[in-house]
Structures are given as C-alpha cells and as structure tokens.
C-alpha cells in the first residue's frame, strides 16, 4: 500500500487542526487549541488506489518555527491553508513556500493553496485573489470549510494526486537521464 | 529507541478510583505518549481514551466517557488516565500509546510505540 506523507502548514487560527480532524474523525472541532504537533494515518481509496494518509498537524504559533525544518523535510506534499477571513494568513503563505522549497532544495514540491473558513461572511481575501496566487505557483487551490466540511476531502485527495503526478515526473526523468547517458557520441 | 512505561495499576473495588501514567523515555514531540487502549481476556485491545500534545483535544471510548478523563504533563513527557467509578467490565490490561495514531472509522485503532501494559482489576 502507498503511503503518502502529507504537512499541512500555515499561520495560527487558520483551521489546520479542525481540517485534519474533520478528514479524519468526521466532526468539527469548535474550541481552538493551538496546535504544538499532531500526527494521524488513515487509510483511504483514491482514484480506486487504496493508500496510507500520514498527516502531520503542524504549529501555526512562531514559538515553534524551528521544528519546520525537521517536518518540511520529510513530506511529500502540503497543505498551504489560510483562512479567507484574514488577510495577513494569505500573506504568510508565501513565506511557507519559500520555505518549503529551500527546505526541500527544489521548485516544484507538491502544493495545494487552501482557503479555509469559506462558511464565514467576513471574507477578507477574494477568491480570485487566491486562484491568480495558486496559478503563479502552478498548484491548485480549493476552499473549504471544516465546518460544514465543504472541499475537506477535495483539498487532501488532491495533494495526493499532486504528489503522485510529481512521483511520475520524477521517474520519467530519471529515465530520460538514464537513455541520455546510454547514447553514443 | 522509544520505550512507555506504565504505572498505577491494581486491584480496586466497583465505584473507586485508580490514576494510571505513562512516561516516555524519549524526548522529541512525534515520540511523546498520546493515549490508552485496553485489553480484557479474551477480548481484542480496544480504543480507550487520546489525547493531543497541546492537550486541548481529547477522544473517549463511549463506554467510559464521563468516567474517565485524560490529560498529560509534557514537562514530565507524561500521560495521565483518571479512572472513577470503576466497574467489573473496566478490567483488563491497560496499554499506553505514542507517536503517530492511526484512525478509522473515526477512532483511533493503532499507535506507533506500546508499551508493556498494567493490570487493572475491579471487583465487585
């Protein structure tokens, strides 16, 4: 069975816990508890592949930006989310994947921008501000609510395809590289 | 190498109390204990109580929802499970869990690291 490492990052209060916890337990979580680390493995059917999630339920506080480095090294893939009610929160998530991809040593690490909060009226951050950000990267965007669960699936489902089209990539490459150095001067 | 140790276990009658803990000897985050499952003879273990690192987010098994309450002390990279009104059916083996937690069905149903377990007995 694949097993899939996926981080999800992002500014305090933006939802990251109440995201992961609606995928994984079905239910929302109200209270905000700032996270210091979580890390949870479901095992779910994508696209008719059966596959090992392995979340980590990252810090949002800047009390604990030194253990980024240690996590951004191990995923696969990650979750940028933001909350569409607070501006400096999308602002923030260019630093993240500035720091992802120094972290990572490479510019095009699976990514999916999240808007989360989307059942909140008090939006701050249009989506089209967002989607022009995603298509800067060239990674998706998806908004949700962990709320009413809105895009939850939709937004995890999706780095994992992310992840897996940059495995195919990867390996085309590695094949190319290997027919390259087979040929003849 | 990862290592649980469990204490406070016993022999108790219905309706008293036991604290059982568990300390972790290792000292990163992913490593710290996380909750309790349990096991009566005969049975399969089974999902008791979970709780985050920040110990703001807590799970309960039905069955002891009310009764018991986890919490942890990360200064002392500890565990706790309070158990009160103990009943007959509450004995069995009590294992402490840490680092990642696997889920289904919306419970936890495994952890990476166990440890060797304490026996709780409540007699009636």
């Known amino acids: 069975m694949t097993e899939y490492k996926l981080v999800v990052v992002g500014a305090g209060d933006v939802g990251k816990s109440a995201l992961t916890i609606q995928l994984i337990q079905n239910h929302f979580v109200d209270e905000y508890d700032p996270t210091i680390e979580d890390s949870y493995r479901k095992q779910v059917v994508i696209d008719g592949e059966t596959c090992l999630l392995d979340i980590l339920d990252t810090a949002g506080q800047e009390e604990y930006s030194a253990m980024r480095d240690q996590y951004m090294r191990t995923g696969e893939g990650f979750l940028c989310v933001f909350a569409i009610n607070n501006t400096k929160s999308f602002e923030d998530i260019h630093h993240y994947r500035e720091q992802i991809k120094r972290v990572k040593d490479s510019e095009d690490v699976p990514m999916v921008l999240v808007g989360n909060k989307c059942d909140l009226p008090s939006r701050t951050v249009d989506t089209k501000q967002a989607q022009d950000l995603a298509r800067s990267y060239g990674i998706p965007f998806i908004e949700t609510s962990a709320k009413t669960r809105q895009g939850v699936d939709d937004a995890f489902y999706t780095l994992v395809r992310e992840i897996r089209k940059h495995k195919e990539k990867m390996s085309k490459d590695g094949k190319k590289k290997k027919k390259k150095s087979k040929t003849k001067c | 190498d990862v290592q649980l140790q469990e204490s406070g276990g016993g022999l108790v009658q219905a309706g008293g109390s036991l604290r059982l803990s568990c300390v972790a000897s290792g000292r990163t985050f992913s490593t710290y204990p996380t909750g309790w499952f349990r096991q009566a003879p005969g049975k399969e273990r089974e999902f008791v109580a979970r709780?985050?690192?920040?110990?703001?987010?807590?799970n309960y098994a039905d069955s002891v929802k009310g009764r018991f309450t986890i919490s942890r002390d990360n200064a002392k990279n500890t565990v706790y499970l309070q158990m009160n009104s103990l009943k007959p059916e509450d004995t069995a083996v009590y294992y402490c869990g840490g680092g990642s937690t696997t889920w289904a069905g919306g419970i936890p149903t495994n952890f990476d690291y166990w440890g060797q377990g304490t026996q709780v007995t409540v007699s009636s």
């Open positions: 709780i985050n690192l920040s110990g703001g987010i807590t």
